[in-house]
Structures are given as C-alpha cells and as structure tokens.
Interface confidence: low
C-alpha cells in the first residue's frame, strides 16, 4: 500500500513578511517524526501520531517547503509552494519641465520600486483620470516611460503614475498605488518679436506712452514683461486679452539720459524671450524766452528786446535771426506811443535726427505816455439843431488810460462823451474837453452852436 | 453631486458693473476650468470667457473689449464674472458652467442669473 | 472666430419619428492634438443647457442611447433615432477647438 504526507495549505499566497500556519500530515501507522524542510524560520507547534504542525514567520520571498516522513523504512515527502505578494514601496512620477511648449513631445517618466510578483505588476500613466500608457513591470526598480504630445489643454493637467497588483486570480484582489500627481504647464510664444510702439523723439521731463504688444502666446497672463528706456526701467500696466498680451507704459526722459536711446521690450514666457528694440533719441528743447528791459516803459526811453534759447536752438526775433543757434537774439528800440501794446515774436527751431521741432513764444511792450485827444475824432465845431439827438464822438488815449470829460465854460455843465443825448439851446457854448490822466493832462476845445427849432 | 450655484438677479443702470458669482460643489474646485456663458432673451447662446482656479489663467472674448473680468476665490470654490459699462442689450441671463479637460466640453451648468439693464 | 451653423431652425417631428439636425463650422475643428472638440447640447424649457454629446460621438453619462453624433472637420450631425416628450427643446452645437468657443444659432424640436 502507498502511502501518502499532505502538506496544508496547498500553494498559499500571503503578503510580504507574514506568518503561515503549515500542517504536515500522514495516513501511515507507523511513520516516524515527521520533518520540515525550508530555509523559512520556523517554529513546531504541535505534533501528533502522523502529524505535525509548524508556523513559519517573517515570509519575504517565494518559497517550496517540503515535508518528508519515514514510513516502514521509506521516505515519503510532501510540498507546498508559497508565493508572497507585497506592494511596492515607491511609486515616483519623474518631474515635468518647468514649461512645456505646444506641440512639442515630452516624456513621462514613472519608477516604481518593489512589489511582487512582478508578472502581476502592471504600472498605467495618467492625465487626468485617462490613461495615457499601460505597461508590466520589468526590472528593479520597474521604470516605464510614455511619450505625449502637449497641448494647450494639458495646461495645469494633472499627471500621474499607478501601479496595480492584480491578485484577484488568487481571490485577494486588485491592489492599486498612485503616485503624487505632477501639473503640466504648456505654453505658446510665436517666434516673431513684440510690437513696440514708441516715440521717435522724447524731450526731457515729458512723458509719452509706449506700447507693447505680442499676440499668439498662451497663457498670456503667465508672461513677464519688460520695459525700459536705455538702463531705466518703466512701470508697464500688463493687460491680456484671450493670447494677446500688451503691456503699456509712460516713458519720461531725465536730462541726464539726452542724446541717441533705445526703448526695448521683453517678453518671458517658459523661459524663452522675445524682444523688440526701437530707437529714441532724448533731447533738450529749453525757450524760446523773450525778454524786455522794461515790461513797461517810458516814453522816449530804450528798451531792449531779447530772444533765447538752449543749446543747439535757432532763434529768430521778429524776423532777424541770431548770430548762430544757442546765441541770443536782440534787438533796440526807442519806446514811442505807437509802440504801446507792440508784440515781439521769437520763434525757435531745434534740429534733431534730420526733424526741424519748431516753437515760438512773444512778448507785449507797454509805453507809458501822456494824455492826448484825437482831432480827427473830435470836431472842434458842432453846428446841430435844437431838440435832437447826437453824440460827442470824442476820443481819448494815452497809457495809463486817461479820463475824458468836456465841462462848459463858465459853468460845470458836462455833456456826455460817446453817449448819444438830447441837444437843446442850453448847449450852445464852448467846452473844454479834457483827458486827464498821472501823466498829465490834455485840453480841446469843442464849440457847440445850436440852432433854435423853427416853428413856422 | 456636482453642483453650481449663482448669485441672484440684478437690474443695472446704463454705465454701470454687475458681478455675478458661481459656487462650487460636489467636486475639486482647481481640477475643472469654469466658464461663462450669456443668453439674450430669446436668442442663442454666447461664450464670454474661462478661468483655471488652479493657475487663475483667464481666456476671454475680445469681443467685449476688456469689459468683463473672471476671477477665482478657492478657498471659497468660489468663481465671479464682472461685466463693466453695461449697456440694454447686455441685458441677458449669464451661466456658469465647469469642463473637465478630458472631455472639453461644458458638462455641469449654473441655474443662470438675469442681470436687466435699464433706465 | 468659428462660426457655427444649423439647420434646420425648427424641427417639427411626432413622438416616436428620427430626426436629425446638422451643424456646420467655418473652418475644421480639428485641433492640433487631433481631437475634434464638437459637442452638443439640449435645453429645455426654462432649463439651463445640458450636455448631450461630447467630442462628435461620445455620450455623456446618463444620456439615453437613441441619441447618436457623427461627423467630422466641419460637418456634424445629431440624430435621435426615436423622439420622446422630454427630448422636445432647443438644441444648439458648439465648438471648443478655437478661441473664442462659439455655439451654433439653435434647433427647435417641437411637436407637428
């Protein structure tokens, strides 16, 4: 008769560094001590006629275990054989590039390191919640790789790495691991230059705004910009709108920043640049100013009229020009009546980068002179008729600007000067006229001869 | 469940600003990108911009000329959409509405709310 | 900007009939990652939209399978293949593979 050394549990699965409960047993009557054979730690823990029971501890690798029995002088052996399932102790999603151009490949890379049984291993890389890749798990550490095509939708797409134990053939399931997920950041910077809206010219201590702008980027609102005049960095105010990105600012020149300059604007985007230069000369405009000696002067005095400017300006004082540009330009004269209220014009001319910027500026004279009466505006004989309406059409001038009044002799009679009124016989007489003024004082005398009114 | 709740109706002089709130729930408010979407009376429907909470990257319409304004608050899973100079026919009911990025598209909808725009 | 366009306007149909409504785009929506971004959607009466059908062909989750998407470049078309009572509504398609999204002008379907 043959007979038979079981060995319970047939073909057990337990996780990494467990414990197994393993029972050799014999229908032979007259078997010896029943033996185990395994390079396990392991402990008996019972035994019996045709049985013995052993527990096996700190289980880390596949293993056989063979169980041998001497019966009637033979040797009878059993085996079991264990498999040991444990999930990895890393899984690692490799980190992304900082920036990823559109449509520009880039690789995932996942590591994973432990797990077992490797045949069941299965490593899946994911965007989103879509797999992108599914590969078993080779080598230690298990590296799997996957090439992706970025999009402008996988920016701020999350990535990430799973592994999956599949241990459900065995009856114990599907054991997953993910990794930390990594955020994808794609971006678009086109290859032409910015556009760069500058002045050709700027004068010190004025503003002018610059623009800057750059279309076809994506995410417009995560570009940097950069905006200067020469080594002077301008305060940009930066507005996207869907990919087009400008950036504003207000250029103001220092005096110590005249001659030829560069505006320049810089665009950074995922580490690349795009730049755009123009050219700006700076420059100093300063007049023209015109002078007088004496704002107001006197009559019959000299008054001198002068016409300046900065450095490198051409003058030119009511048609004369000065000598040579940054000089000054004048000119005398002797201050007459006629010259009261007299504008002197300047105009200034600037040369810069073959333009000609052009710029005037005047002056006005007072003369200060006595009291005169126009003749020519004063009749010194009226003949009107008695009960009718008419005016003195007399006029007066002089600088300060004199007092008019005409007062009958012999009597304070005034009649009213440049204001229509009505004449009768009272009128008739003769008038002083005078304009007065704290230059003095001017006397006409005005005859009014009134005819009596009719009545035949 | 995924939910979007918006702000109640407004009614808004010539010249004036309205802005509109979106609540999430239900979900990871930085994982999905919100958009915003108007409907005049009786007509079709109009895209005006989205936001990514997670960046706050925003994409509009240029069609409203830099008048509307989309944000993000995510510690509240709140997202807003500011409409400036309003005029009568922005006078319109204006939804929210969340996409994931795989499938693109609107799957998740705010009720609406009718801003009025009038003297 | 794509511009987006469907026919019919108003689709009178009897419960039970197919119907069938086409949209077409001013130029492709084939992105460059060669995804088509087309999608359709149905509101309904004093209802916000909802989405139908996303990427040409895919149904969203829970959306009965009598309705089906076709299509490709700049040529689509929603079919129902058995109209019931809570289909009726108007259903717009829109494209989200070029800035800005745009959405077609709408389809009635309504009772004959």
């Known amino acids: 008769q043959e007979f038979l050394l079981r060995v319970e549990p047939q073909n057990p699965v337990l996780s990494a560094g467990g414990s197994l409960f393993v029972n050799c047993s014999t229908d032979c009557p007259s078997s010896e001590k029943i033996a185990l054979e395994t390079s396990l730690s392991k402990e008996l823990v019972a035994s019996g006629m045709g049985w013995a029971a052993f527990n096996l501890s700190n289980v880390t690798g596949n293993s056989r275990i063979l169980c041998s029995v001497y019966c009637n002088g033979s040797q009878i052996t059993g085996s079991s054989n264990i498999t040991v399932y444990g999930l990895p102790e890393r899984v690692e999603l490799a980190p992304l590039p900082p920036w990823q151009p559109v449509g520009q490949n880039f690789t995932l890379r996942c590591q994973v390191e432990g797990g077992s049984p490797r045949t069941s291993l299965t490593v899946v890389l994911l965007r989103w919640e879509e797999e992108l890749s599914r590969q078993p798990a080779v080598e230690e550490p298990a590296e799997v790789t996957a090439t992706v095509l970025a999009s402008r939708d996988d920016h701020g797409a999350p990535f990430s790495c799973r592994t999956e134990l599949d241990m459900q053939p065995q009856g114990l399931g599907l054991f997953v691991n993910t990794s930390a997920p990594r955020q994808l950041r794609t971006f678009v910077l086109p290859v032409t230059p910015p556009r760069l809206v500058a002045p050709r010219f700027l004068e010190v201590e004025t503003s002018w705004p610059v623009d800057c702008t750059l279309d076809g980027l994506f995410p417009a609102s995560e570009a940097q910009v950069y905006l200067a005049l020469g080594d002077q960095m301008l305060n940009a105010t930066v507005m996207n709108h869907g990919d087009t990105l400008t950036a504003t600012a207000t250029a103001t020149a220092r005096a110590d920043q005249e001659g030829a300059r560069e505006i320049v604007c810089n665009v950074t985007l995922g580490g690349e640049r795009r730049e755009a230069r123009e050219n700006l000369t700076v420059f100093s405009f300063l007049g023209p100013i015109v002078n007088l000696s004496e704002p107001t002067a006197h009559e019959g005095s000299t008054v001198t009229v002068s016409c300046m400017a900065g450095a490198r300006v051409q003058v030119t004082l009511d048609g004369v020009p000065a000598a040579a540009p940054g000089q000054t330009a004048q000119l005398q004269l002797n201050a007459t009546e006629s010259d009261d209220g007299r504008s002197f014009f300047c105009s200034a001319t600037l040369e810069v980068d073959g333009e000609f910027l052009h710029r005037n500026s005047s002056v006005q004279l007072r003369v200060l002179y006595g009291p005169k009466i126009d003749r020519a505006t004063c009749p010194q004989h009226l003949k009107w008729k008695d009960k009718t309406r008419h005016v003195l059409q007399c006029q007066a001038r002089g600088n300060p600007y004199p007092e008019l009044r005409c007062l009958k002799e012999g009597s304070s009679r005034e009649v009213p000067v440049g204001i229509p009124f009505f004449v009768n016989v009272t009128h008739n007489g003769t008038y002083q006229c005078q304009a007065s003024s704290s230059r003095g004082k001017y006397t006409l005398v005005v005859v009014m001869d009134i005819e009596a009114f009719s009545s035949h | 469940q995924v939910q979007l709740v918006q702000s109640g109706a407004e009614v808004k002089k010539p010249g004036a600003s309205v802005k509109v709130s979106c609540k999430a729930s239900?979900?990871?408010?930085?994982?999905?990108?919100i958009l915003w979407v108007r409907q005049a009376p009786g007509q079709g429907l109009e895209w005006m911009g989205k936001?990514?909470?997670?960046?706050?990257?925003?994409t509009y319409n240029l069609k409203f000329k830099g008048r509307v304004t989309i944000t993000a608050d995510t510690s509240t899973s709140t997202a807003y959409m500011e409409l400036s100079s309003l005029r009568s026919e922005d006078t319109a009911v204006y939804y929210c509405?969340?996409?994931?990025?795989?499938?693109?598209?609107?799957?998740?909808w705010g009720q609406g709310t009718l801003v009025t725009v009038s003297s | 900007d794509a511009v987006m366009t469907q026919t019919p306007l108003s689709l009178p149909v009897s419960l039970g009939d197919q119907a069938s409504i086409s949209c077409r785009s001013s130029?492709?929506?084939?992105?460059?990652?060669?995804?088509?971004?087309l999608h359709w959607y149905l509101q309904k009466p004093g209802q916000s939209p909802q989405l139908l059908i996303y990427?040409?062909?895919n149904r969203f989750s829970g959306v009965p399978d009598r309705f089906s998407g076709s299509g490709s470049g700049t040529d689509f078309t929603l079919k129902l293949s058995r109209v019931e009572a809570e289909d009726l509504g108007v259903y717009f398609c829109?494209?989200?593979?070029?800035?800005?999204?745009?959405f077609g002008g709408g389809t009635k379907l309504e009772i004959k």
């Open positions: 239900g979900y990871t408010f930085t994982d999905c990108i």
């Open positions: 509405a969340r996409k994931e990025a795989y499938p693109d598209a609107m799957d998740y």
């Open positions: 130029q492709s929506l084939v992105h460059s990652n060669g995804d088509t971004y």
């Open positions: 936001i990514n909470p997670y960046f706050g990257t925003t």
């Open positions: 829109s494209q989200s593979t070029h800035v800005p999204y745009t």
């Open positions: 990427k040409v062909s």
